[in-house]
């Protein structure tokens, strides 16, 4: 079954979806849409990319990542609660039947007050890759963590990991990747 | 107005070869998956290739590896390279639009081309 | 593969009567609440027409008199009252898994 996601009222939601490119800039056609993946397409597309860009999106619709490095997760923003639902990640990798496809579904709770979670200290043991968070300036890139390569058999490891998303929204929020490659 | 124009069906021995043509127009054609469907003479469908707009292909087990379907979203067209034939794949050939967002199911439809495969 | 099976082969009916198709399923064709079954009508040297899209959705276009219900692995499709142009060959059609399948038709003829 789908991996579950949640986010709250009013903060961007985060959904992980990853593949590795062949080589460098060496990508595939990938789409985001509103709706479990149907046989062939995305559903209500509410993204796409081809293999030089981003070609298609809608508003509050975004990719935080470096795509052109595999990761194209996808950062809703601002979510509201009619935004809850299924979402579909598919990487249209050429050739017959080559699809990889993932339903994710997202769970908008109700807004809290409550104050907003500090960085746990284990979290760098539970994502090998590197972390980076970018602050409004060129300069201000942080390492949070060193982590090693992330493929298409283990996003649902780290997708679980992620399933909690407070944590990921409040890298999000400030403008966290994945870099994949 | 959607269109859908197939052309390229003929007779052709068996062991032989046929390109066919789907021309589309009235539609942003490299937002659709599209497909082949077959229909032999006095039968029912059956579907026998589709492409997606990302470029995945998709065959039944009855063509796969003497069917290549193709695209050029340049000329708003699909193919249907067919190799190897036999005479059960004698059937007009449809070349069919997947409904937008799913591409498993189809919305439009073109008239038809009639592949012969006899000696 | 999905095995789609169409019952009866033949309907004879009369202008004005109610036909009532089935399809049936080899495996349940449910996909997050969604039934991905379709259902077209063929005319004698015309292409395919779809009509009906997951289960009971009336394609645009088509006239009322067409609905369709059913899920998981039993489907129908019900033409309240025959008009002289519903006269026709009728397929399902499944789109929840590769290969796409189709039934092998429904002629519905003029009692």
């Known amino acids: 079954s789908e991996v579950e996601y949640r986010a709250e009222v009013g903060q961007n939601a985060y959904l992980p979806c990853f593949y590795t490119p062949a080589a460098p800039g060496n990508l595939v056609p990938v789409c985001w849409g509103k709706g479990a993946c149907p046989v062939f397409e995305c559903g209500n597309v509410v993204l796409r990319t081809d293999e030089r860009d981003v070609n298609y999106w809608t508003s509050r619709y975004w990719l935080n990542g470096d795509f052109r490095k595999g990761d194209v997760s996808l950062t809703i923003e601002n979510v509201t609660l009619a935004d809850s639902g299924i979402y579909c990640c598919r990487i249209q990798i050429p050739g017959i039947m080559n699809d990889e496809k993932f339903n994710l579904k997202l769970v908008i709770k109700p807004a809290k007050v409550t104050p907003a979670p500090t960085l746990q200290r284990d979290f760098t043991a539970a994502f090998p890759r590197m972390l980076t968070t970018r602050g409004h300036g060129p300069a201000e890139t942080q390492t949070l963590g060193s982590l090693p390569d992330i493929n298409l058999t283990q996003i649902s490891t780290l997708a679980n990991e992620l399933r909690d998303s407070r944590l990921a929204n409040d890298l999000r929020d400030s403008g966290a990747t994945i870099r994949i490659g | 107005e959607v269109q859908l124009v197939e052309s390229g069906g003929g007779l052709v021995q068996p062991g032989g070869s046929l390109r066919l043509s789907c021309a589309a127009s009235?539609?942003?054609?490299?937002?659709?998956?599209m497909s082949w469907v077959r229909q032999a003479p006095g039968k029912g469908l059956e579907w026998v290739a589709a492409?997606?707009?990302?470029?995945?292909?998709y065959y039944p087990d009855s063509v796969k590896g003497r069917f290549t379907i193709s695209r050029d979203n340049a000329k708003n067209s699909c193919y249907l390279q067919m190799n190897s034939l036999r005479a059960e794949d004698t059937a007009v050939y449809y070349c069919?639009?997947?409904?937008?967002?799913?591409?498993?199911?189809?919305?439009?439809w073109g008239q038809g081309t009639l592949v012969t495969v006899s000696s | 593969d999905i095995v789609l099976t169409q019952s009866p082969a033949t309907l004879s009916v009369s202008p004005g009567e109610r036909a009532t198709l089935s399809c049936r399923a080899s495996?349940?064709?449910?996909?997050?609440?969604?039934?991905?079954m379709q259902w077209y009508q063929q005319k004698p040297g015309q292409a395919p027409r779809l009509l009906i899209y997951?289960?009971?959705n009336v394609e645009s276009g088509v006239p009322a008199r067409f609905s369709g219900s059913g899920s998981g692995t039993d489907f129908t499709l019900t033409i309240s009252s025959l008009q002289s142009e519903d006269f026709a060959v009728y397929y399902c059609?499944?789109?929840?898994?590769?290969?796409?399948?189709f039934g092998g038709g429904t002629k519905v003829e003029i009692k």
């Open positions: 009235g539609f942003t054609f490299s937002r659709y998956a």
């Open positions: 069919a639009r997947g409904r937008e967002a799913d591409g498993g199911y189809f919305d439009y």
């Open positions: 059609q499944q789109s929840m898994k590769v290969p796409l399948t």
């Open positions: 492409i997606s707009s990302g470029g995945s292909l």
């Open positions: 495996e349940s064709v449910e996909y997050y609440g969604t039934s991905l």
């Open positions: 997951a289960a009971s």
